[in-house]
């Protein structure tokens, strides 16, 4: 999906009002310095591509993020404020089998959510030069 035509300000508002708090809740008890940010993004569409990938694509050691509250809110934000996004998701669903994954918070998941926090912060500051 090409995130170029999303309403970035509306997505930013959703992040600031609620998604950010859910990410903090998920990370509660973890030191902010515990993980190094290794994933970056260069502009808002790129950031949303990376955010979608880290949030919804299962990775080795962390397969359970999609059912977390911040993930649900991210998905709904993309569906409402990115034209055609929900249609791509609906179509993709037809080929998927139902997978009911238990929510398990592993260290790998905490690291992944830490990366997500960094991507969201970058998304909110699009004019900053890439380090």
């Amino acid at each position: 999906y090409d995130f170029t035509n999303c309403d970035f300000e509306k997505i930013k508002a959703a992040y600031l009002s609620t998604i950010s708090k859910d990410l903090i809740t998920y990370m509660s008890g973890t030191k902010s310095t515990e993980f190094n940010n290794t994933v970056s993004c260069s502009n808002r569409p790129h950031c949303l591509t990376e955010i979608q990938s880290l949030t919804f694509n299962p990775t080795a050691g962390c397969a359970s993020l999609a059912k977390e509250m911040f993930a649900m809110k991210t998905k709904a934000a993309l569906a409402i404020w990115c034209p055609g996004y929900s249609e791509t998701q609906i179509n993709a669903t037809q080929a998927m089998k139902k997978r009911r994954k238990r929510k398990v918070t592993t260290n790998k998941c905490l690291e992944q959510v830490s990366q997500l926090q960094g991507l969201w912060r970058r998304f909110n500051r699009p004019l900053l030069k890439q380090q």
Epitope: K67, M69, K73, T93
Partner: nanobody
């Protein structure tokens, strides 16, 4: 398998109000999110509003300030209160529960009541 049954569609005049209901055969928030989509003739299906188990809500710009989404956990029912209706709100409305990893599941959609705004 979750069943969703929508009701409340019909013909309404511009400026009028209507409330859609979506009854689920199980915990409405079993997977944290309920949404109302709509599809106007010849257009893509769009998500107009979503509500989460923590009570927070999202609205599309086109309906913000006119539509209100809510849920009654004790009745396993979600609602969409639609006020100040416009002809461009004419569409088939679907409620959907997110019941699959990473995508909206068509398996959990009801038939969708048609709501027509016309004088």
């Amino acid at each position: 398998e979750v069943q969703l049954v929508e009701s409340g569609g019909g013909l309404v005049q511009p400026g009028g109000s209507l409330r859609l209901s979506c009854a689920a055969s199980g915990n409405i928030f079993a997977n944290n999110i309920m949404g109302w989509f709509r599809q106007a003739p010849g257009k893509e299906r769009e998500l107009v509003s979503a509500i989460f188990s923590d009570g927070s809500t999202y609205y599309a710009d086109s309906v913000k300030g006119r539509f209100t989404i809510s849920a009654d956990n004790s009745k396993n029912t979600a609602y969409l209160q639609m006020n100040s209706l416009k002809p461009e709100d004419t569409a088939v409305y679907y409620c959907a529960r997110d019941d699959i990893v990473g995508a909206w599941s068509l398996d959990c959609w009801g038939q969708g009541p048609l709501m027509t705004v016309s004088s």
